[in-house]
Interface confidence: low
């Protein structure tokens, strides 16, 4: 229904706390360089204005769209051009072009320092002094670094953060209580960020239809007892929610997500038997819980997929009459039977099925032509299964750090032109798939591995788009989203690459490395490994292992030495010489 004042409607639906949080996230995601104080001031002004409109919906400007109101606020920020350059040109446009322009200027890799967690005592002090400001800082810092973070989900993580601090700051040993818990939230939030970015990429590059197909597959796997009409309704609603969030309409997105959660909880009987636990929770926890609820038990009496989609004499007629509906039912039926497949794989199979019908239904004898389609799925299914087996075996043999290094070597060989920091980030993220997925039961491994890898590779593509340097990467990134992972897996050593000259300074280290946290030490070593591969792209695994073992031994020796600086300055050059010899 239409409301006289959109801002008043959203304020009333969401409540002041969530309203303010979402407006803060929206501003932080659009203007990523502004300080917390600058954004907090804008948020307060918008909130005060919203309250005016709640009191009187016909007050001045209350009838304006949220884009107009928020955009006008952003365009009035002092020194917009000095700080944001051509983003200021967006302000010359009228809505809806202005908002589109803001979206195009979102930076997936802003040059902001890493979000450092303060020391436990300091954190607890500032949390106790002003929990609202503390949480505001958290929302601001995450949102500006992740401009497509799913806003209602970020409110959920802030709530988690709040609960952890409330609990741990009351304990004697705050540090040992906070660290593992906050590390857990951070890891989950980072995964949530790349997954959501993938959804927005799907929406931006391929439109709502592509996203809806993803949603149908995912929902059919989770709710195999729901009928096709129910799945379609949920997929349509979920598509709307994600479209809004990806489009910067965060108030609408959060409001519609709450509505969807409400609908699911009121219709459990026709959706799934596994929802009750989620539905007993408060709003943010409820929606989060529903988004990762376990799969319902599959119906025992499902007929073979071939009956309706291969053996039925009306296949081509049904397809011609309503292509999208017919393909949608195929995707639904196949997905509900295969919770053990990744969504990417299910979409590849649906695409293969569609291509087969397009070709066969135009021939003289269609059934003879499409009769073998299910058999033709086999190689498409085997490829990711082999990928999972090979990679999980390697992970079990090498552990997370060693597995990351193996991937780093592989990907540096595939795309040596890509910057070393991007390769290291990608390899570290891709390598985490082992810890995340390889320990799961067999039937959960494939969906976990492939859908996670696809999300990480989407980030690789986004970073590469900004400064394209590798034809290999461009080729894989310009295809469809579901083909990207197989494309990257199939890449081999880039034969066109001219190896980098050996520069001793790239492999020169100083005693300050000894005091770095373990993660930073690993990144330094992995940076050196990528540079080695760029120098010798065809180095064997044994050669690289020799060099890396030598390097690790050198660090260990010098970091234990009484005079570290002397050790580094005398042993360092020897190490460089040995490296060159080993790779010669």
């Amino acid at each position: 229904e239409a409301h006289k004042s959109e801002i008043a409607h959203r304020y009333n639906d969401l409540g002041e706390q969530h309203f303010k949080g979402l407006v803060l996230i929206a501003f932080s995601q659009y203007l990523q360089k502004c300080s917390y104080d600058e954004h907090a001031k804008l948020v307060q002004e918008v909130t005060d204005f919203a309250k005016t409109c709640v009191a009187d919906e016909s007050a001045a400007n209350c009838d304006k769209s949220l884009h107009t109101l928020f955009g006008d606020k952003l365009c009035a920020i002092p020194n917009l051009r000095e700080n944001y350059g051509e983003l200021a040109d967006c302000c010359t446009k009228q809505e809806p072009e202005r908002n589109e322009c803001f979206l195009q200027h979102k930076d997936d890799n802003p040059s902001l320092p890493p979000f450092e967690r303060p020391e436990a005592e300091a954190m607890c002090t500032s949390f106790k002094e002003n929990p609202t400001t503390f949480m505001g800082h958290y929302l601001h810092e995450v949102a500006r670094r992740h401009p497509y973070f799913y806003a209602p989900e970020l409110l959920y993580y802030a709530e988690q953060y709040n609960e952890i601090l409330t609990q741990c700051c009351a304990e004697a040993d705050k540090e040992s209580c906070l660290t593992p818990k906050l590390d857990g939230v951070k890891e989950k939030a980072l995964v949530s960020s790349v997954r959501q970015r993938m959804k927005c990429s799907s929406m931006q590059k391929f439109g709502e239809r592509a996203f809806k197909a993803w949603a149908v597959a995912r929902l059919s796997q989770t709710f195999p007892n729901a009928d096709f009409a129910e799945i379609t309704k949920l997929a349509t609603d979920l598509t709307k929610v994600n479209k809004e969030c990806c489009h910067g309409d965060l108030l609408e997105c959060a409001d519609d997500r709450a509505e969807l959660a409400k609908y699911m909880c009121e219709n459990q009987a026709t959706i799934s038997s596994k929802l009750q636990t989620c539905c007993d929770k408060p709003l943010l926890k409820k929606a989060h819980c529903l988004s990762e609820v376990e799969h319902d038990t599959m119906p025992a009496d499902l007929p073979a997929i071939a009956a309706d989609f291969v053996e039925d004499q009306e296949v081509c007629k049904n397809y011609a009459e309503a292509k999208d509906v017919f393909l949608g039912t195929f995707l639904y039926e196949y997905s509900r039977r295969h919770p053990d497949y990744s969504v990417s794989l299910l979409l590849r199979l649906a695409k293969k099925y569609e291509a087969t019908l397009e070709k066969c239904c135009a021939e003289a004898n269609p059934p003879a032509c499409y009769g073998t389609v299910l058999a033709e799925f086999q190689p498409l299914v085997e490829e990711p299964k082999n990928l999972v087996k090979t990679n999980c075996d390697l992970y079990e043999k090498l552990g997370e750090y060693g597995f990351q290094n193996a991937i780093l070597v592989r990907y540096t060989q595939k795309a040596p032109q890509v910057s070393t920091p991007t390769l290291v980030e990608a390899a570290r993220n891709l390598g985490r798939v082992g810890t995340k997925c390889c320990t799961l039961p067999e039937d959960q491994r494939l969906p976990c591995v492939e859908d996670y890898l696809s999300a990480i590779l989407n980030r690789v593509c986004l970073l590469h788009e900004k400064t394209p340097v590798s034809e290999h990467v461009t080729k894989c990134c310009s295809g469809s989203l579901v083909e990207r992972r197989p494309c990257f897996s199939a890449l081999t050593v880039d034969e066109t690459y001219v190896p980098k000259e050996f520069k001793a300074e790239t492999f020169t280290f100083h005693s300050d490395i000894c005091t770095l946290p373990e993660k930073e030490k690993q990144i330094k070593k992995q940076t050196a490994l990528a540079e080695l591969v760029k120098h010798k792209p065809k180095a064997t695994a044994e050669q690289l292992k020799t060099v890396m073992d030598d390097f690790a031994q050198f660090l260990d020796t010098c970091c234990k030495a009484a005079d570290k600086d002397t050790c580094f300055s005398t042993e360092g050059p020897n190490l460089v010489t040995r490296c060159k010899d080993a790779l010669a």
């Epitope: 006008d72 365009c75 020194n79 917009l80 051009r81 446009k93 009228q94």
Partner: nanobody, 115 residues
Amino acid sequence: QVQLVESGGGLVQPGGSLRLSCSASGSIWGIYHMGWYRQAPGKQRELVASITVDGSTHYADTVKGRFTISRDNSKNMVYLQMNSLEPEDTAVYYCDIRNVGGDYWGQGTQVTVSS
């Protein structure tokens, strides 16, 4: 090159009124924002009022109901009518105009509210 000149500042008693004017000259086309900002001694510059391309106005909470911003497109002028002035309004007031070419500021005009 764009030049902005503010005028209308001065000394006024609490409760009094002033009207600030800002005149823009030079190649000023595609204006999307005109605003008044102020900076009190030792404080950061802050937005007082702004008016956008479609005539929407925005005001700082501290001046709502007392100040009115308006513009005359044909003359490239922006005005700030200030009523019920308070000592806290004492500051240098700057005019800001933004167009495709950039963000342009005037030299400022001093407003002092004192008895």
